[in-house]
Interface confidence: low
């Protein structure tokens, strides 16, 4: 163990730009201060002298999601009988670099609505709100990523297991299906241009069958049909 109390395992946990830095160890002997900066700026302190091992840095990283950020965790003795106070140069450890636009995970999408009319199935994905602000309002996921953001629809006849896929760079799918057949489907957010963290988890599965539709209504889950 590091007797200086230096933090370790600094890890960025970020989904749809909600961004938290986590580290170890949880210690009764030390408290921590987190500092964050871009390559061009001075360090800014956050989460002063906290006993926690996480710090929410969302407010800092959403200022410019295209910037690359680095954080560091400074360690201080929790109880210090020394009258000189805290050390001037406390031990610290740097985080990996973090570029929100490239590194935030895509959250699980939600199917906002769907409608099957004849041989057409229309599925709309809810445009998730992020914590990125422009002109005082929170931007949607698509407003941040633009056409970098695609959605993939996985769909299959309720009576079979063979999945088909469709892709859109809007939030809507309009696909051809067999008339009179019930279909189930889920969606996944995708940023094809990324080298990593390209895909979100899949959404919950929805189905067009009346029986399942009634079951959802009984549990208070309503869909807005176009």
């Amino acid at each position: 163990a590091d007797t200086t109390g230096r933090a370790y395992n600094l890890t960025w946990k970020s989904t749809n730009f909600k961004t938290i830095l986590e580290w170890e160890p949880k210690s009764i002997d030390h408290v921590y201060t987190v500092q964050i900066s871009t390559r061009l700026e001075n360090w800014k302190s956050k989460c002063f002298l906290t006993a926690e091992t996480e710090c929410d840095l969302t407010d800092e990283v959403v200022k410019d999601v295209g910037q690359t950020y680095m954080a560091r965790v400074l360690s201080y003795p929790a109880r210090n009988g020394n009258t000189t106070g805290f050390p001037e140069e406390p031990p610290f450890r740097n985080s990996p670099e973090f570029t929100p636009y490239l590194d935030t995970n895509l959250g699980q999408p939600t199917i906002q609505s769907f409608e099957q009319v004849g041989t057409k199935l229309n599925v709309t994905v809810q445009d998730a709100r992020t914590l990125v602000r422009r002109n005082g309002t929170f931007l949607s996921l698509r407003a941040v990523f633009g056409k970098d953001l695609n959605y993939t629809l996985y769909y299959w006849r309720a009576s079979s297991t063979g999945k088909k896929t469709a892709t859109t760079n809007t939030n809507e799918f309009l696909i051809d299906v067999d008339k009179g057949e019930n279909y189930c489907f889920s969606v996944q957010a995708v940023i094809p241009s990324r080298k990593r963290k390209q895909r979100s988890p899949e959404s919950l599965t929805e189905c067009t069958s009346r029986e399942q539709g009634r079951a959802r209504e009984m549990t208070g889950h309503h869909h807005h049909h176009h």
């Epitope: 410019d64 295209g66 490239l102 445009d127 698509r142 941040v144 633009g146 809007t170």
Partner: antibody, heavy 124, light 108 residues
Framework: QVQLQQWGAGLLKPSETLSLTCAVY????????WSWIRQPPGKGLEWIGE???????RYNPSLKSRVTISVDTSKNQFSLKLSSVTAADTAVYYC??????????????????WGKGTTVTVSS | EIVLTQSPGTLSLSPGERATLSCRAS???????LAWYQQKPGQAPRLLIY???SRATGIPDRFSGSGSGTDFTLTISRLEPEDFAVYYC?????????FGGGTKVEIK
């Protein structure tokens, strides 16, 4: 107020490579797409292609084999290269910002900020 | 490729008159991705209308957009001297994004 300032060589010989750069002032590259459009003398507008801040591109298929659009986020600028030019590539070349706008669930794209244009002439 | 055909090619009108410009698409275009631009000689195009109906920031309310599917219209309710220019429709929903050939609104 976001402004686009563009520059590059204005006179080329056939078979040379056209190279233009567009710098973004007063705003970030991220969250937008960045386009190149051209306009031959006395004619209409033709979309060449676009790039996102992360480097993903879309090109006009009619030019795809000759076009490269790149982005340099550290300099807040993006560039166009068009190889093997001919007289048919003589045009005013514009850079533009392709903005996503969301209102009550509707998503829209439009080119709301344009560079002033660079006149490129291809002549032997 | 979606071909946008604008008509008429030239519109000769007097200040104060109403101008109606048409943009017809070779296949259906989502109104979300249909925009109109104004261009004056020696200048870059200027965004007027996005999403087929919404006026861009700073555009006077005499400009309005309408239509859906394959037929879209830009209307200038009362022409002002500064409105005489070339107008382009554009679709940005399907690659390659395309512009119409333009309608020139000239002083009669």
């Amino acid at each position: 107020q976001v402004q686009l300032q563009q520059w590059g060589a204005g006179l080329l010989k056939p078979s040379e490579t056209l190279s233009l750069t567009c710098a973004v002032y007063g705003g970030s590259l991220s969250g937008y797409y960045w386009s190149w459009i051209r306009q031959p003398p006395g004619k209409g507008l033709e979309w060449i292609g676009e790039i996102g801040a992360s480097g993903s591109t879309r090109y006009n298929p009619s030019l795809k084999s000759r076009v490269t659009i790149s982005v340099d986020t550290s300099k807040n600028q993006f560039s166009l290269k068009l190889s093997s030019v001919t007289a048919a590539d003589t045009a005013v070349y514009y850079c533009a910002r392709d903005t996503p706008y969301y209102y009550e669930g509707g998503y829209y794209y439009y080119m709301d900020v344009w560079g002033k244009g660079t006149t490129v002439t291809v002549s032997s | 490729e979606i071909v946008l055909t604008q008509s008429p090619g030239t519109l000769s009108l007097s200040p104060g008159e109403r101008a109606t410009l048409s943009c017809r698409a070779s296949q259906s275009v989502s109104s979300s991705f249909l925009a109109w631009y104004q261009q004056k000689p020696g200048q870059a195009p200027r965004l007027l209308i996005y999403g087929a109906y919404s006026r861009a920031t700073g555009i006077p309310d005499r400009f309005s957009g309408s239509g859906s599917g394959t037929d879209f219209t830009l209307t200038i309710s009362r022409l002002e001297p500064e409105d005489f220019a070339v107008y382009y429709c554009q679709q940005a929903g399907v690659v390659p994004y395309t512009f119409g050939g333009g309608t020139k609104v000239e002083i009669k």
